[in-house]
């Protein structure tokens, strides 16, 4: 840009140097040159001379008009054509910006990752504003009425040390730029309800050599939360559809989960957990790939055969990835195992 230019005159912008994208804009240039009665005044945008919509107002001043200006940034300067001078003479320059007022922040979510010592709040910022936009996060205790504010650009981490006064808070976010301000909806937060258990990790898997081979997946977490509900999803690497198994877990010991899988196939497993009865999930764990052993007998493989069904009651769901680029956005077709056949349930989003 041209923020430190020595002007021999003035340049100003109506409605202002930062304005709403798509507005009509007038830029004025007024010369105050010594020993020059300019024949012409010229405007340049980003170094290129402008040809249209220029009006000479009087001897010293000219205006250029833009209909529906839609560039996020431009630098403007103007020059004079002085008699007897070979080159144009610089008068002044200005950086101009256009943008949008912020959208109201949406989908405000606050979680405490176990052992992190922080409450992390995130939100959707909406459409790009193209100009400097700040987010002010308000955290108000519902017990003491004390309010704290934090400045953020896209998310905020608030030390739980500064949230010692109470357990219940009201959280909201203001989006602010020079074109406007919008508030998110307020979020009621109880600190005990937003803890996400420490990461769950699949440590190993093995397939037994039994008549009906089974795969045992071992997984663990360092969580101190006693009641944890988990999901493990799995599929062959060639498949788009996930199956999901649900578990109540107690991480005082390593978890073992049994699966009856197709032989000689490469499977990928992932696990995620939440505190039982709460709504915030861990992200899915890193994919764990396991190759099942080759079939030794001649038994025909039936994915819904009885050995699978004869485990303790559980729900297995089938989940189809919408696209390989969005592994976390899934559509889930719940299917409860009953008499060896899948029974379709409702779609729900687990992404």
């Amino acid at each position: 840009g041209i923020t430190s230019i020595n002007c021999s005159g003035d340049m100003w912008v109506e409605p202002g140097e930062i304005f709403q994208m798509g507005m009509n804009v007038s830029i004025y240039c007024q010369e105050a040159l010594k020993h020059c009665r300019p024949r012409n005044l010229y405007f340049y945008k980003n170094g290129f001379k402008e040809e249209f919509d220029i009006t000479r107002i009087n001897r010293t001043t000219a205006r250029i008009w833009y209909k529906g200006f839609s560039e996020p940034h431009a630098y403007m300067h103007c020059t004079a054509e002085c008699p007897g001078h070979f080159q144009e003479t610089l008068i002044c320059g200005k950086d101009i910006s256009s943008g949008h007022p912020p959208d109201a922040p949406s989908n405000l979510t606050c979680v405490i990752y176990e052992y992190s010592g922080n409450m992390t709040c995130t939100w959707n910022t909406g459409k790009p504003t193209y100009i400097d936009t700040k987010y002010i996060v308000h955290v108000k205790s519902l017990e003491t009425e004390e309010e704290q504010q934090y400045l953020a650009s896209s998310y905020v981490k608030i030390s739980t040390d500064s949230l010692q006064g109470s357990r219940k808070y009201l959280v909201w976010v203001q989006a602010v730029n020079s074109l406007g301000m919008e508030n998110s909806q307020q979020l009621h937060v109880h600190l005990d309800d937003i803890v996400i258990p420490s990461a769950s990790i699949i440590s190993r898997a093995e397939t037994t050599n039994d008549t009906v081979p089974k795969t045992i997946v071992y997984w663990k977490s360092k969580t101190m939360i006693e009641k944890v509900f988990c999901e493990m999803r799995y599929k062959t690497t060639t498949n788009q559809t996930w199956s999901v198994k649900e578990f109540d877990a107690n991480f005082t010991y390593v978890q073992q989960s049994e699966f009856y899988l197709e032989p000689d196939s490469k499977y990928v497993f992932q696990v995620r957990c939440q505190e039982t009865g709460k709504r915030n999930w861990q992200p899915w764990s890193s994919p764990f790939v396991h190759q099942t052993s080759q079939e030794t007998g001649k038994r025909n493989w039936q994915p819904w055969s009885s050995p699978f069904v004869h485990q303790t009651s559980q729900t297995v769901s089938q989940v189809t990835a919408k696209s390989s680029h969005e592994p976390q956005k899934m559509e889930m077709l719940s299917a409860t195992i009953f008499r060896g056949h899948p029974a379709s349930g409702n779609h729900q989003d687990i992404g």
Partner: nanobody
Framework: QVQLQESGGGSVQAGGSLRLSCAAS????????MGWYRQAPGKERDLVSM???????FYADSVKGRFTFSQENAKNTVYLQMNNLKPEDTAMYYC??????????WGQGTQVTVSS
Amino acid sequence: QVQLQESGGGSVQAGGSLRLSCAASGDTYSSCTMGWYRQAPGKERDLVSMLMGDGSTFYADSVKGRFTFSQENAKNTVYLQMNNLKPEDTAMYYCGCATLGSRTIWGQGTQVTVSS
């Protein structure tokens, strides 16, 4: 840690003017996003004006065209020129230093009372 001290408040008739000052001390002032806030009794502390990183200034709709935010870097001081004051501008006015990810630091505040 930044310390902030406001001054310039007082009582004024509707239509009058006041100029608030906020002097900052401390070595992290340069990283502050400075703002003026106000809090009426029983209400939240609301943002009135803030200096943005691109050199522009935010003004709340209720004060646009009447209030002007300025700063004097050499003195580590910011100002809020308030013209055409209205009774609804009555509040405690605070300046604040906000840095990304940190809790906003406030001054002690200065009272502005506008009578009709």
